[in-house]
Each structure stands twice: as C-alpha cells, then as structure tokens.
Amino acid sequence: FERTRSLQDPCSNCPAGTFCDNNRNQICSPCPPNSFSSAGGQRTCDICRQCKGVFRTRKECSSTSNAECDCTPGFHCLGAGCSMCEQDCKQGQELTKKGCKDCCFGTFNDQKRGICRPWTNCSLDGKSVLVNGTKERDVVCGPSPADLSPGASSVTPPAPAREPGHSPQ
C-alpha cells in the first residue's frame, strides 16, 4: 500500500523538514527559515512559535520541530505546551484577583503556585498536634495521649496534600 501510495502521490516521499512544493513540480523543498514540518508528506511548513514577552525560549525551532517556550523567572507555565504564563507568589500565599495574598489562618501553601489548603485535622485520626502549622507549612500530627506508651511511634506524617488547583477569590 505504501509503495502504491507513493507512486500516486509524490508528496509522500517528502521527509520531515521539507514540504511538497506545488510551484516547483511537487519536488521536496526545505522548510524556509522560521518554519518547520514535523512529519513527512506535508504540503506546507508551519510557522515556528516565537517565545516573546513573558515567554522564554526553552528549545529553539528546527526544520523538524517547533520551538518550545517556558516562562520568565517569577512566572510558571500553564496550559498545554506552556500556552500561558502565570505569576508566582511566595510560599504562604495564593494568587487572587487582588494579586498575591497571605493564606488565611488555618491554611497553608508550601509552593509558589496553587491555593492555600487547610491544615490537616489531626483529631480526625485520633492524633494530637505535635508541631503547629504556619502559612507555609502543614501541622505535624503526633500520637494521641493514650498512645504515649513505651515503644509507640512518636510522629505520624500528615496525609499527602492533594494536587494544588487554582480557585481565585
């Protein structure tokens, strides 16, 4: 089938990095500067992505692959292929419509992105608070008084936090 197709369609022989040039009797021409084709048999080359403004170039465009962008320091990528950049906050803060704001009492954020999450409720597991929480750190749960017998484990790490999402105020 491939042989038959290539006999019928000369463009199928054009490799990645080239395009099938209708203006030149369907011969394979190299992609022009600032363009690429990532698959064979293409009739046009795609324009390379330009990483401008808050975007930085992570990988240069080549004749066979698009440029890849990331974000300037102080910002992080969002969306498929880093389609957007969102500003970082400090640990102990979350990004809201009014900018970076400190986590409310009883919540924390240990990252530069995402939302403030409630401290672990140690008492739900019958534990006591061994180390108090802060804006930047969750509480550390310790044993309940009844567990303080010889040989008992002294510290239970808090349950893993869920993946931070983003919910502006």
């Epitope: 389609s83 957007m84 950049c85 983003h166 502006p168």
Partner: nanobody, 123 residues
C-alpha cells in the same frame, strides 16, 4: 498577527501624572481580561492591575490602589492606565498583557505581551 503596542511613557516629576495606552490587534479584544505589569530596574516583573472583558471589574496591586486607574475602550481595542501622584518607585517599564482563556475563573495566566513603555519618575 496578535499584537499589543504600548505608548505614553516618559519622564515625569514626582507627584505628576501619565496616561499609558495599549492598542490591541489581531484578536477579539472584548473577549479577554487585560492586565498591566511593570518591571523596575534590576527587579522582577510585578503585576499592577487588570480589568474584566466588559470593564465591570478592576483590581489593583496594593501600592498603586487609589493612584492608578485601569480602563478600556472595546470600540477602540485599547486598554489604558492612568497614573497619578507618581513616585520614584513607580519608575519601570510597563507592559500590557492579554489574559488567556479562562482568566480569573480558573487561573491568572497571560498569553500575549507587549513590548513595553518606559516610565521614569524623577525630579
């Protein structure tokens, strides 16, 4: 081509005023939140203000609240930043940026950025 072009920067004395403009082209302007950022010499980028698609919501960074006013004219595909009572610490390159799809509902990501206009506050 999607484009943002800022203008209106310049040298102004402390206490003075400037009005920055950002002209948008190549996209449906009225469908996007618009944002102003700034970058002072030797510092990182700082968010200044943003405005909802229809202009009904406006938010400001604490240090500019009450001195700066963001506005937009969707008929002219433009967003503005009126800056009053300027201080030396307002000296920066000011950038206009477009909020990406879903801005303010699920994120505050921007996807298009202007080239910037320089504001210098000095006596």
């Amino acid at each position: 081509e999607v484009q943002l072009v800022e203008s209106g920067g310049g040298l102004v004395q402390p206490g003075g005023s400037l009005r920055l403009s950002c002209a948008a082209s190549g996209f449906t302007f009225s469908s996007h939140w618009m944002t102003w950022f700034r970058q002072a010499p030797g510092k990182g980028l700082e968010w200044v203000a943003h405005i909802k698609e229809d202009g009904s919501e406006k938010y400001y960074e604490d240090s500019v609240e009450g001195r700066f006013t963001i506005s937009r004219d969707n008929a002219k595909n433009s967003v503005y930043l009126q800056m009053n009572s300027l201080r030396a610490e307002d000296t920066a390159v000011y950038y206009c940026a477009r909020g990406g799809d879903g801005y303010s509902d699920s994120h505050f990501g921007v996807d298009v950025w202007g080239q910037g206009t320089t504001v210098t506050v000095s006596s």
